[in-house]
């Protein structure tokens, strides 16, 4: 959470002389309350924007916009404090709009914007606009807050930002997963243009449950340069457990720019559709189960096995 580096922060507009200042998030009016204070912002609107830094990086920023109520309290409005709180880390960043001239009513509702808070992909924020001076203790609140969830790097707008590209967002593995038979799964994906290894994580689930019944990890060695952008295929051996039929395949790359923290891509194979009509019951019931294929477990290593190929 930081401010966009190279921009001259401007808040002046026709009819108002205004300057933007860094803030400690503790305005003086908390310590020295005033008798007359302005009302709260009318509407806060927040959306995501992408801006470039002075180093040419593209970063996600919050665009914050708000309007004033059309009451007489604008005569006592001396500015505004904008605060962005990252919900998980409790990190807070504030700026202060300082009005250097008195506000007057004019034919349009006063509107303010600020687009300099740099945020992180896949993070949750609370944005607060506090009109200044802040109210006396037990006075009516004169702030408004809104939450905002920054999309993750899979979002089209975010993919091209520098933090997302660093974590491998431009790689589209175009995964296809195919069930060959009850015991084999074929995974195809496109390799990226980097000589780095990949890991395939297979998690299987029963038809209607979210707790796994089988997990397997498969390592794919780094491809040679002539294999970049080619399709790679892997055949994974499944654990032969009845009903363990929904398979989630996740591919984890280890690119040099993100190492263990690269974006993972996944694909899921659903269980086969259940037939609408029940299986017919045979006319006779055998007194014993045939020995072959009777076990729920494979005879070999039940951790699963696999082999892979790169296709040119």
């Amino acid at each position: 959470l930081r401010l966009l580096d190279h921009r001259a922060l401007v808040c002046s507009q026709p009819g108002l002389n205004c300057t933007v200042k860094n803030s400690t998030c503790l305005d003086d009016s908390w310590i020295h309350p005033r008798n007359l204070t302005p009302s709260s912002p009318k509407n806060i609107y927040i959306n995501l924007s992408v801006s470039s830094t002075q180093h040419g990086e593209l970063v996600p920023v919050l665009h914050v916009e708000w309007t004033l109520q059309t009451d007489a309290s604008i005569l006592y409005l001396e500015g505004a404090e904008l605060s962005v709180l990252q919900l998980n880390t409790n990190e807070r960043l504030c700026v202060r709009f300082e009005f250097l001239s008195k506000l007057r009513h004019h034919h349009r509702r006063w509107r303010f914007t600020f687009s300099h808070f740099v945020v992180d992909p896949d993070q949750e924020y609370e944005v607060t606009v506090h009109h200044l001076p802040k109210p006396i203790p037990d006075g009516d609140p004169n702030h408004q807050s809104k939450n905002f969830l920054v999309p993750d790097c899979e979002h089209a707008r975010m993919k091209v930002t520098t933090p997302c590209m660093s974590s491998g967002s431009l790689w589209d593995p175009n995964i296809t997963v195919e069930t060959l038979d009850t015991q084999h799964l074929r995974v195809d994906f496109t390799l990226w243009n980097e000589s780095t290894h990949y890991q395939i994580l297979l998690t299987s689930f029963p038809h209607m449950e979210n707790h796994s019944c089988f997990e397997h990890m498969h390592h794919i060695p780094a491809p040679r340069p002539e294999e970049f952008h080619q399709r790679s295929n892997v055949t994974l051996t499944l654990r032969n457990l009845k009903g363990c039929c929904r398979h989630q395949v996740q591919i984890q790359p280890f690119f040099s720019s993100c190492l263990n923290d690269c974006l993972r891509h996944s694909a899921t194979v659903s269980c086969p559709e259940m037939p609408d009509t029940p299986e017919p019951i045979p006319d006779y019931m055998p007194l014993w189960e045939p020995r072959s294929g009777s076990s729920d477990y494979k005879d070999d290593d039940d951790k699963g096995s696999s082999h892979h190929h790169h296709h040119h």
């Epitope: 509407n43 609107y45 927040i46 959306n47 919900l87 998980n88 880390t89 409790n90 949750e124 807050s145 809104k146 939450n147 905002f148 969830l149 999309p151």
Partner: antibody, heavy 116, light 107 residues
Framework: QVQLVQSGAEVKKPGASVKVSCKAS????????ISWVRQAPGQGLEWMGW????????KYAQKFQGRVTMTTDTSTSTAYMELRSLRSDDTAVYYC?????????WGQGTLVTVSS | EIVMTQSPATLSVSPGERATLSCRAS??????LAWYQQKPGQAPRLLIY???TRATGIPARFSDNGSGTEFTLTISSLQSEDFAVYFC?????????FGGGTKVEIK
């Protein structure tokens, strides 16, 4: 694979307290907040609050303020929700979920029955 | 607090058909809306957030339209695993609030 595994069902008497645990795996607990949501039998979902395992910061729904405490133990990657002064209308399935706004992974739920 | 209202309470649809679920907020919530699916005896599962972004692993047949106060979840072609209860939830301001749910059942 991200998983949140909750403690087992509890039966409590009115006035008692209950403490539900939620063990996270497949990710670092401090990377995201943990929210708690409950669902009374046959009813909808009710948000109770959240805790940031990173900062310890909490936010509780006004309805539960003073009666609920959310904590985390990062050494065991576990979040806890304690609800005190239980009443019969606190009978519900209590869920923990990852994140604070849009809740992307949920525990399997813990049924808490309050009955005399 | 913001009140979320879902309609209809129950929706009867045949497999392969399109389902349209409605969610209304008592005041504008921009695009700060999430949709969840819940099957009997299971926890809810996040489908969509930001009113239109599908969560990881959610098929493209699930989509949302709307912003402000009116939202619509569309399931383009219902599969057998889609019959469940669907909840909307706003995260624009505290407290987070959920709609009462729409049950999608087999016609």
């Amino acid at each position: 694979q991200v998983q949140l595994v909750q403690s087992g069902a509890e039966v409590k008497k009115p006035g008692a307290s209950v403490k539900v645990s939620c063990k996270a795996s497949g990710y670092t607990l401090t990377s995201y907040g943990i929210s708690w949501v409950r669902q009374a039998p046959g009813q909808g979902l009710e948000w109770m609050g959240w805790i940031s395992a990173y900062s310890g910061n909490t936010k509780y729904a006004q309805k539960f303020q003073g009666r609920v405490t959310m904590t985390t133990d990062t050494s065991t990657s576990t979040a806890y929700m304690e609800l005190r002064s239980l009443r019969s209308d606190d009978t519900a399935v209590y869920y923990c979920a990852r994140r604070q706004l849009a809740l992307d992974y949920w525990g399997q739920g813990t049924l808490v029955t309050v009955s005399s | 607090e913001i009140v979320m209202t879902q309609s209809p309470a129950t929706l009867s649809v045949s497999p392969g058909e399109r389902a349209t679920l409605s969610c209304r907020a008592s005041q504008s919530i921009s695009s700060n809306l999430a949709w969840y699916q819940q099957k009997p005896g299971q926890a809810p599962r996040l489908l969509i957030y930001g009113a239109s972004t599908r969560a990881t692993g959610i098929p493209a047949r699930f989509s949302d339209n709307g912003s402000g106060t009116e939202f619509t979840l569309t399931i383009s072609s219902l599969q057998s695993e889609d019959f469940a209860v669907y909840f909307c939830q706003q995260y624009d301001t505290w407290p987070l609030t959920f709609g009462g749910g729409t049950k999608v059942e087999i016609k």
